[in-house]
């Protein structure tokens, strides 16, 4: 039975040209995390695998940095980066847990972090 929950940074906003850290945390399970996939809509951004380490999409090689931890740092943000991001935790023996983050990239300097929320 899948008992874990994923806590994410929730709905967040950031300034155009700036950077943002996307973070997810898996808790309430003893399952082993074998791989975390980061996706934007249907596009794979990066993979962090327990054996193979980090691998970043060539399409984002200059704007995505691994970490901190299992998180992902997006740099040189543009308005086109606005949208949904997903952290997909592949675990053994539980299976797959998915967290959702919504990022809004703002033209102005009024960029505030939203509240954290949990996805069971």
């Amino acid at each position: 039975m899948m008992t874990g929950t994923i806590e994410t940074t929730g709905n967040i906003s950031a300034e155009k040209g700036g950077s943002i850290i996307l973070q997810c945390h898996l808790s309430s399970t003893t399952a082993q995390v074998t791989q975390v996939n980061w996706e934007q809509q249907d596009q794979l951004l990066a993979i962090c695998n327990a054996d193979l380490g980090w691998h970043i999409s060539p399409s984002f090689k200059d704007r995505v940095a691994p970490g901190p931890g299992l998180g992902l740092t997006l740099q040189s943000l543009t308005v086109n980066d606005t949208g949904e991001y997903f952290c997909i935790y592949h675990t053994y023996p539980d299976g797959t847990y998915t967290g959702r983050i919504f990022l809004e990239v703002l033209e102005s300097s009024v960029a505030e972090h939203g509240a954290r929320f949990q996805i069971p």
Partner: antibody, heavy 120, light 107 residues
Framework: EVQLVQSGAEVKKPGASVKVSCKAS????????MHWVRQAPGQGLEWMGL????????GYNRKFKGRVTMTVDTSTSTVYMELNSLRSEDTAVYYC?????????????WGQGTLVTVSS | DIQMTQSPSSLSASVGDRVTITCKAS??????VAWYQQKPGKAPKLLIY???NRYTGVPSRFSGSGSGTDFTLTISSLQPEDFATYYC?????????FGGGTKVEIK
């Protein structure tokens, strides 16, 4: 036209090492991951690992960890796969294969293959 | 590791036949599945990626479908040049893994 041209067939003794090359042309070499896949005679396909010429980042199938090394020479657009401590079961055709543009973990172009025979 | 179980391992068919090959993943791989065609002594060639996207230059008689754990490659009307071995591959989780292959032979 994208081309991946591999080095010629090799015959090696058990315990020896082999280094296979794969020269890429027809595209921007540092924009795509390169993978190595092998196929034993009459058998299926087995993924060995990947290397990213942009930053030399590698990842190896745990089955080969400690025995395989993948390297890059960007000046000649060539990737290399070296396999150590050869045994008879390493007899196979070794292919380099380029990672796809939308996801780097499927293979859109393949080299012609290099037969490595391990025999005493 | 994710096991990709292909069936059948071989089949005999005639030119013009509709051929279906299935691939079952041991866990959910969403739609991260590719299909390849390999002829004797040659490297594999990409046919389908993302479970259902036909690769550039691949004839429309080849189609892929499925998501989750069950995937299908269909050849709507088998042509003489289609006699070959077909492999599925998952690319959701490392290590990347292939099915055992399906050899399509002439009846």
């Amino acid at each position: 036209e994208v081309q991946l041209v591999q080095s010629g067939a090799e015959v090696k003794k058990p315990g020896a090492s082999v280094k296979v090359s794969c020269k890429a042309s027809g595209y921007t070499f540092t924009d795509y991951y390169m993978h190595w896949v092998r196929q034993a005679p009459g058998q299926g396909l087995e993924w060995m690992g990947l290397v990213y010429p942009y930053n030399d980042n590698t990842g190896y199938n745990r089955k080969f960890k400690g025995r395989v090394t993948m390297t890059v020479d960007t000046s000649t657009s060539t990737v290399y796969m070296e396999l150590n401590s050869l045994r008879s079961e390493d007899t196979a055709v070794y292919y380099c294969a380029r990672g796809g543009p939308s996801n780097w973990n499927y293979f859109d172009y393949w080299g012609q293959g290099t037969l490595v025979t391990v025999s005493s | 590791d994710i096991q990709m179980t292909q069936s059948p391992s071989s089949l005999s068919a005639s030119v013009g036949d509709r051929v279906t090959i299935t691939c079952k993943a041991s866990q959910n791989v969403v739609t991260a599945v590719a299909w390849y065609q390999q002829k004797p002594g040659k490297a594999p060639k990409l046919l389908i990626y993302s479970a259902s996207n036909r690769y550039t230059g691949v004839p429309s008689r080849f189609s892929g479908s499925g998501s989750g754990t069950d995937f299908t490659l269909t050849i709507s009307s088998l042509q003489p040049e289609d006699f070959a071995t077909y492999y599925c591959q998952q690319y959701t989780l490392y290590p990347l893994t292939f099915g055992g292959g399906t050899k399509v032979e002439i009846k």
